[in-house]
């Protein structure tokens, strides 16, 4: 069973998590981003159910094509460059889901925008903290 | 159709700059990125870096970090990659490619007949 | 970075032969969301810029004769020429387009045998 330190600390790195991925959809969400528009033309798969830690597989599978979309608007919209970022989130991510169990993610048919993905993805951690809290 | 054609060779002598200039055709430079990549004689394929003329924004290969300035006219849909501190080793054909969609690294459809940049004392 | 790694390093067919090379990647190219091999294979003849002939490991690209096939996922891949003609004499060389930098193999010379 999960002891409160546990708890705790998964707490944290979801908040963390979650700060990450917001801060991103923040900066491409900047009403000064002229890359938007090319940006949401990219398509990025989203996982059929995310309910579970271990359903952040689904998030690490897409991190890669997340950073060089990414990259096309790194210096005006992000503090950090996007492969630092990226390998922030992969750390925690990692972390988080933990490597016992080999998980085959399953995503769903349609496809989304980077700003669909990361709102997903922002949800997610939203309700998982709100279940530990 | 998509052209891009590139300036003539160089002869550079070690420790100075060239400037290679890559005029894009048959479409609008500012819809997708423009790629560098560079052969030395006999050699493989080696990636430098792209810029999105759109808006200068740029992307280099680690390697070339700090020696290689890529910019971008739009007004002349010219494109341009400088590298200097230049030293034998960097004696190649550098090419400017053009990737087949938008996706940042998508593969290079479009390619210049490439300039031959040789560095000798 | 990705190291892509080819063989052989060159290869000597006799005309109306397949040819077949191999390129291994140091990470998988599959993007399990769309399932796609994100791999492509260039030609390249003396004096020439590259051309590419395949992407997404076996998508041929626009105008490229269909005796070019590319196959693989993961980490493994080849590309077959499957009756050599004399103007397929060339360099050939695989490239990862899933991450930067976008890394290519060293080449593998195909001749006439």
């Known amino acids: 069973a999960p002891t409160s330190s546990s708890t705790k600390k998964t707490q944290l790195q979801l908040e963390h998590l979650l700060l990450d991925l917001q801060m991103i959809l923040n900066g491409i969400n900047n009403y000064k981003n002229p890359k938007l528009t090319r940006m949401l033309t990219f398509k990025f798969y989203m996982p059929k159910k995310a309910t579970e830690l271990k359903h952040l597989q689904c998030l690490e599978e897409e991190l890669k094509p997340l950073e060089e979309v990414l990259n096309l608007a790194q210096s005006k919209n992000f503090h950090l460059r996007p492969r630092d970022l990226i390998s922030n989130i992969n750390v925690i991510v990692l972390e988080l889901k933990g490597s016992e169990t080999t998980f085959m993610c399953e995503y769903a048919d349609e496809t989304a925008t980077i700003v669909e993905f990361l709102n997903r993805w922002i949800t997610f951690c939203q309700s998982i903290i709100s279940t530990l809290t | 159709q998509v052209q891009l054609v590139q300036s003539g060779a160089e002869v550079k002598k070690p420790g100075s700059s060239v400037k290679v200039s890559c005029k894009a055709s048959g479409y609008s430079i500012t819809d997708s990125l423009i790629h560098w990549v560079r052969q030395a004689p006999g050699q493989g394929l080696e990636w430098m870096g792209w810029?999105?003329?759109?808006?200068?924004?740029?992307n280099y290969a680690q390697k070339f970090q700090g020696r290689v300035t890529l910019t971008a006219d739009t007004s002349t849909s010219t494109a341009y990659m400088e590298l200097s501190s230049l030293r034998s080793e960097d004696t190649a054909v550098y090419y400017c490619?053009?990737?087949?969609?938008?996706?940042?690294?998508?593969?290079?459809?479009?390619w210049g007949q490439g300039t031959l940049v040789t560095v000798s004392s | 970075d990705i190291v892509m790694t080819q063989s052989p390093d060159s290869l000597a067919v006799s005309l109306g032969e397949r040819a077949t090379i191999n390129c291994k990647s140091s990470q998988s190219l599959l993007r399990n969301g769309n399932q796609q091999n994100y791999l492509a294979w260039y030609q390249q003849k003396p004096g020439q810029p590259p051309k590419l002939l395949i992407y997404?490991?076996?998508t041929g690209q626009s105008g490229v004769p269909d005796r070019f096939s590319g196959s693989g996922s993961g980490t493994d891949f080849t590309l077959t020429i499957s009756s050599l003609q004399a103007e397929d004499v060339a360099v050939y060389y695989c490239q990862q387009h899933y991450v930067t930098p976008p890394t290519f193999g060293a080449g593998t010379k195909v001749e006439i045998k």
């Open positions: 490619a053009r990737s087949l969609d938008s996706y940042p690294i998508d593969p290079f459809a479009y």
């Open positions: 997404y490991a076996s």
């Open positions: 810029i999105d003329p759109e808006d200068g924004e740029i």
